[in-house]
């Protein structure tokens, strides 16, 4: 899609990366909010979950998400046959048996009920960004990140390294 993209070029092999072990290295229960401090909330509607990005009223309780961390080997992009290093991947679960999924065809982020082992669409490369923020890159679609669009979560293509710090793909994790 983005032939000139450094991010795309480098991470085109993300889907070939191997999760080292099927057990998470650690888990973390946190609230998820945007760079602008809007909360990510989850609501059960018609037997399915909807994801919202909204301002909470004062003292309103934030929804929590269970982040499960996985260590993953990254294949070398130049030759395709070597290991270029390690990265951290996460899955995000706001409630039992439901996980955030990347729907690359619809460019959407959805909550799906599924059993383990989880599909690749539920895995995201966790990026440690400036200003105590993180970003989530799709394992199945390198160069595509979870972002905020029209008060919903969506998949956003990042076409250059400069855009990695675009505010709409930056999120904050908090224990409170």
């Amino acid at each position: 899609a983005f032939g000139i993209s450094g991010v795309q070029k480098y991470t085109r092999a993300l889907h070939d990366s191997s999760i080292t072990g099927i057990s998470p290295i650690t888990e973390y229960l946190a609230s998820l909010s945007t760079y602008n401090d809007q909360s990510i909330t989850f609501a059960l509607e018609d037997e399915s979950y909807e994801i919202y990005v909204e301002d909470l009223k004062k003292d309103e309780k934030k929804d929590k998400v269970l982040l499960s961390y996985y260590e993953s080997q990254h294949p070398s992009n130049e030759s395709g046959d070597g290991v270029d290093g390690k990265m951290l991947m996460v899955t995000l679960s706001p409630t039992k048996d439901f996980w955030l999924h990347a729907n690359n065809k619809e460019h959407s982020v959805e909550l799906h009920k599924c059993e383990k082992p989880l599909p690749d669409q539920a895995f995201f490369v966790l990026h440690n960004m400036h200003s105590n923020c993180v970003s989530f890159e799709c394992k199945t679609d390198p160069g595509v990140f979870i972002g905020v669009k029209d008060n919903h979560l969506a998949l956003i293509k990042v076409d250059s390294s400069e855009n990695l710090c675009t505010e709409n793909i930056l999120f904050k994790l908090s224990e409170t």
């Epitope: 450094g6 991010v7 070029k9 480098y10 991470t11 290295i25 650690t26 888990e27 973390y28 229960l29 946190a30 982040l67 961390y69 990254h74 070398s76 992009n77 130049e78 270029d84 290093g85 390690k86 990265m87 951290l88 490369v125 966790l126 990026h127 440690n128 960004m129 400036h130 993180v134 250059s160 390294s161 400069e162 855009n163 990695l164 710090c165 994790l173």
Partner: antibody, heavy 119, light 111 residues
Framework: EVQLVESGGGLVQPGGSLRLSCAAS????????MSWVRQAPGKGLEWVAT????????DYVDSVKGRFTISRDDSKNTLYLQMNSLRAEDTAVYYC????????????WGQGTLVTVSS | EIVLTQSPATLSLSPGERATLSCRAS??????????LNWFQQKPGQPPRLLIF???NRGSGVPARFSGSGSGTDFTLTISSLEPEDFAVYYC?????????FGQGTKVEIK
């Protein structure tokens, strides 16, 4: 193969300037955060400066703020460290380092280049 | 800044013995539920090499005899059975916040 090769070190007088370079190969340079870490002779390691992928953010250790500038040229796959107002205590081997993909730790290191500040 | 204190300064052991190195942080290095404490090995005339990241995860190509443990402020690097090539200086380092800091190092020498 992922490689980092530093150059530009040498002998310089106190108050002088030097520019270090780090040529990167074997990976898509622009996607990674890069740093300089130094080691004085017979001493431990000290982080000096970091620049994010995309050149958006830079950070420095207090002792070099206002004197050193980290920069990168993604078109040349090269990291730089411009060092001005050099002091004797800046004498060290300077290592270029690449973060892992996702920017959580220093994963790849160059062989280093020696900077000696002396009159 | 976060100060990392390593002990002992020097460890004198024989090949085949178990080495236990300690690193203590002046405050927690936890962030996002991860312990952002890394271990490096350095041999004379060589650059450091990543051994362990996020307290307990081995870097690429690192032998299984190296293991890391700990959380919060107290961390340990263990070499289960020392090989001749393991005699070197070991540094812990925190990547929780700027300035990124290193411990002063532990030298593992042949007894």
């Amino acid at each position: 193969e992922v490689q980092l090769v530093e150059s530009g070190g040498g002998l310089v007088q106190p108050g002088g300037s030097l520019r270090l370079s780090c040529a990167a190969s074997g990976f898509t340079f622009s996607s990674f955060s890069m740093s300089w870490v130094r080691q004085a002779p017979g001493k431990g390691l000290e982080w000096v400066a970091t620049i994010s992928g995309g050149k958006t953010f830079t950070d420095y250790v207090d002792s070099v703020k206002g004197r050193f500038t980290i920069s990168r040229d993604d078109s040349k796959n090269t990291l730089y460290l411009q060092m001005n107002s050099l002091r004797a205590e800046d004498t060290a081997v300077y290592y270029c380092t690449r973060a892992n993909y996702g920017n959580w730790f220093f994963e790849v290191w160059g062989q280093g280049t020696l900077v000696t500040v002396s009159s | 800044e976060i100060v990392l204190t390593q002990s002992p300064a020097t460890l004198s052991l024989s090949p085949g013995e178990r080495a236990t190195l300690s690193c203590r942080a002046s405050e927690s290095v936890a962030k996002y539920g991860l312990s952002l404490l890394n271990w490096f090995q350095q041999k004379p005339g060589q650059p450091p090499r990543l051994l362990i990241f996020a307290a307990s995860n081995r870097g690429s190509g690192v032998p299984a005899r190296f293991s890391g443990s700990g959380s919060g402020t107290d961390f340990t690097l263990t070499i289960s059975s020392l090989e001749p090539e393991d005699f070197a200086v070991y540094y812990c380092q925190q990547s929780k916040e700027v300035p990124f800091t290193f411990g002063q190092g532990t030298k593992v020498e042949i007894k």
